[in-house]
């Protein structure tokens, strides 16, 4: 999906009003410094597509997050505020139905999660570039 | 282990600009933000901004927008924190703090005295 | 800003006692609350983070509660050392604020 015509600025208050108190929420207990930082994004389409590749797809360690309150909330805001995007995930829900797992905090979990908020915090700099 | 090494007292002139350095070392200098938070004499701790060294983007407190500026020499892996048009109000402990994507401070510099006065 | 309101500003105790000190976020802040220690003339020390997680090395008679607007520092038996100033600090929000202080003296 190409996120260039989202309405950032309505994403961006969806993290700020709900998003991020989730992936607070999520994170606790978890020291600050205990993950490196070592995804980035250069625009906000781009952090967006990382975002929802973290959110979204299972990975090596960490399947469950897309069951979080952060990931549906995200998963919401941007099939409001992304034109279109709401069509393409149909295929990837019912994938992802079929192989529902229970849900468990792993640290490869709380680590993506953290990778997250850094991605997001880049999202929401007010000089980053759109495209 | 971490440490973040702090430059020495300073005594300005109102209108003056004062910058303060925190060397790092003992992790990746890339890894964490970099922070300045100040303490006036018997005041509260006042966070004033931050920076992430990967690419040097900085935020900054509003109450200090326009006067404070937060830059990283890479190849020395120090940080900087310059504050402008000194008043005595300024006068302060300036304090650099490291933090992950969590914002709370595990790690801190000894601290700077700035004394502003004319 | 979120403002964090601390209370008693100054406490009177004597080693071996019990104390506890209060903090107030403006509005809800989760569980994202880290409390500090400082001595003079020296930097803060994290001692709770996550509003009940001690920091590494902090002895167990610090203890801290709390979630949502309301949050507790507990000394469960003074020491000597614990003679300084405490603050409590919000990271749900950007920008991050901290309490405005109880210094701790010695009765």
């Known amino acids: 999906y190409d996120f260039t015509n989202c309405d950032f600025e309505k994403i961006k208050a969806a993290y700020l009003s709900t998003i991020s108190k989730d992936l607070i929420t999520y994170m606790s207990g978890t020291k600050s410094t205990e993950f490196n930082n070592t995804v980035s994004c250069s625009n906000r389409p781009h952090c967006l597509t990382e975002i929802q590749s973290l959110t979204f797809n299972p990975t090596a360690g960490c399947a469950s997050l897309a069951k979080e309150m952060f990931a549906m909330k995200t998963k919401a805001a941007l099939a409001i505020w992304c034109p279109g995007y709401s069509e393409t995930q149909i295929n990837a829900t019912q994938a992802m139905k079929k192989r529902r797992k229970r849900k468990v905090t792993t640290n490869k979990c709380l680590e993506q999660v953290s990778q997250l908020q850094g991605l997001w915090r880049r999202f929401n700099r007010p000089l980053l570039k759109q495209q | 282990q971490v440490q973040l090494v702090q430059s020495g007292a300073e005594v300005k002139k109102p209108g003056a600009s004062v910058k303060v350095s925190c060397k790092a070392s003992g992790y990746t200098f890339t890894s964490y933000l970099m922070h300045w938070v100040r303490q006036a004499p018997g005041q509260r701790l006042e966070w004033m901004g931050e920076?992430?060294?990967?690419?040097?983007?900085?935020d900054y407190n509003q109450n200090f927008r326009g006067r404070v500026t937060i830059t990283v020499d890479m190849s020395a892996s120090t940080a900087y924190m310059e504050l402008s048009s000194l008043r005595s109000e300024d006068t302060a402990v300036y304090y650099c703090a490291l933090t992950g994507t969590i914002n709370y401070f595990d790690y801190w510099g000894q601290g700077t005295l700035v004394t502003v006065s004319s | 800003d979120i403002q964090m309101t601390q209370s008693p500003s100054f406490l009177s105790a004597s080693v071996g006692d019990r104390v506890t000190i209060t903090c107030k976020a403006s509005q809800d802040v989760v569980t994202a609350v880290a409390w500090y220690q400082q001595k003079p003339g020296k930097a803060p020390k994290l001692l709770i983070y996550w509003a009940s997680m001690r920091h590494t090395g902090v002895p167990s008679r610090f203890s801290g509660s709390g979630s949502g607007t309301e949050f507790t520092l507990t000394i469960s038996s003074l020491q000597p050392e614990d003679f300084a100033t405490y603050f409590c600090q919000q990271y749900s929000s950007f920008t991050f604020t901290f309490g405005q202080g109880t210094k701790l003296e010695i009765k």
């Open positions: 920076i992430d060294p990967s690419d040097s983007y900085t």
